[in-house]
Interface confidence: low
C-alpha cells in the first residue's frame, strides 16, 4: 500500500494576517486520524493538534507551515506548504492607476505600487480573489500592467510591499483603488 494521501492546510480567515489580529491554522485529513502534526518549517516549533489558534499575530509567527497526520504506524504525505504572512509590519504603499482608474474595455491600464522604502517585492490583490497576482514578471515589480482590459478586471485592488530578505513580513495594505471598466 502506498503512502497516506496528504491533508489540506488552510488559514482562516486568511493567510494574510494583520499584526495583533487572530488567525486559525487548520489541518484537515480523512476521518479517524490518530494524530496530527502541524509544524513551522525552518524552526523547531510543532504541535500534535490539527488546529493552531493564534490570538494575536506576531512577526515571529510568520513563515511557512506544513502538516501531516498518522494512522496506525504510517505517516501521510505532507500537506502543501502554507505561507502565513504578517501584514502591517511596514507603512502602507500607495496604489495608483495609469493613465487612470477608469478604462474602456479593450484598453490598457497599469497599476503602480509605490513605497518610500527600498522594497524589492510587491503583491497586488483584487478583492474576492484568493491569492495575489504572483506571475513572476509581475511579482518582483512595482508596476502591474493589465493589457486588454475586460469587465472581469473591474473591482477593488490593494497592494503590499515587502523585502525578499523577509518575505513573510509585509507592509500594511495600500488604500483601495477602484478600477472601473466602461
Amino acid at each position: 500500500s502506498g503512502p497516506l494521501p496528504k491533508p489540506s492546510l488552510q488559514a482562516l480567515p486568511s493567510s494574510l494576517v494583520p499584526l495583533e489580529k487572530p488567525v486559525t491554522l487548520r489541518c484537515q485529513g480523512p476521518p479517524g486520524v490518530d494524530l496530527y502534526r502541524l509544524e513551522k518549517l525552518s524552526s523547531s516549533r510543532y504541535q500534535d493538534q490539527a488546529v493552531l489558534f493564534i490570538p494575536a499575530m506576531k512577526r515571529s509567527l510568520a513563515g511557512r507551515y506544513r502538516c501531516s497526520y498518522q494512522n496506525g504506524s504510517l505517516w501521510s504525505l505532507p500537506s502543501d506548504q502554507l505561507e502565513l504572512v504578517a501584514t502591517g509590519v511596514f507603512a502602507k504603499p500607495s496604489l495608483s492607476a495609469q493613465p487612470g482608474p477608469a478604462v474602456s474595455s479593450g484598453g490598457d491600464v497599469t497599476l503602480q505600487c509605490q513605497t518610500r522604502y527600498g522594497f524589492d517585492q510587491f503583491a497586488l490583490y483584487k478583492e474576492g480573489d484568493p491569492a495575489p497576482y504572483k506571475n513572476p514578471e509581475r511579482w518582483y515589480r512595482a508596476s502591474f500592467p493589465i493589457i486588454t482590459v475586460t469587465a472581469a478586471h473591474s473591482g477593488t485592488y490593494r497592494c503590499y510591499s515587502f523585502s525578499s530578505r523577509d518575505p513573510y513580513l509585509w507592509s500594511a495594505p495600500s488604500d483601495p483603488l477602484e478600477l472601473v471598466v466602461t
Epitope: Y46, Q47, L77
Partner: nanobody
C-alpha cells in the same frame, strides 16, 4: 542506527495492570518522539500512545484514561503504564522512535523492537 528493546509484557487478568518499558540505544540524539504501537493477531499495527521529548502526550481514544505514557530522557527510556486492561488490549506491543529531520516531514523510524506480548485473559 537506533536499537529499541521492549520489556514488561505478560499474562494479566481483565482489570489488571502492566508496565511496559522500552530502552533506546545508539543514535539517540536524533530521536524526537517515542511511542507505543500494538498489533493483534490478523490485524494491522496501530498507534497506542506517544510522548515528545518535552513531555507532550497523545493517546489512541480507546486507551485514554487507562494508559499513561512517560519518558526518562536521561535514560533514553519510555514507559507505558496500562491499567484496567481489557481482553481487546491483547496484542504484541512495539516501541518506535520518531525522527525529526532538519528538512522533510516527520516520519516513523524503520527501527522497531522485537515487541513484547501482552495477553489479557481470565
Amino acid at each position: 542506527q537506533v536499537q529499541l528493546q521492549e520489556s514488561g509484557g505478560g499474562l494479566v487478568q481483565p482489570g489488571g495492570s502492566l508496565r511496559l518499558a522500552c530502552a533506546a540505544s545508539g543514535s539517540v540524539s536524533s530521536i524526537n518522539d517515542m511511542g507505543w504501537y500494538r498489533q493483534a493477531p490478523g490485524k494491522q499495527r496501530e498507534f497506542v500512545a506517544r510522548i515528545s521529548r518535552g513531555g507532550l502526550t497523545n493517546y489512541k481514544d480507546s486507551v485514554k484514561g487507562r494508559f499513561t505514557i512517560s519518558r526518562d530522557n536521561a535514560k533514553n527510556q519510555v514507559y507505558l503504564q496500562m491499567n484496567s486492561l481489557k481482553p481487546e488490549d491483547t496484542a504484541v506491543y512495539y516501541c518506535n522512535a520518531d525522527f525529526r529531520p532538519s528538512s522533510g516531514t516527520f516520519r516513523l523510524s524503520d527501527y522497531w523492537g522485537q515487541g513484547t506480548q501482552v495477553t489479557v485473559s481470565s
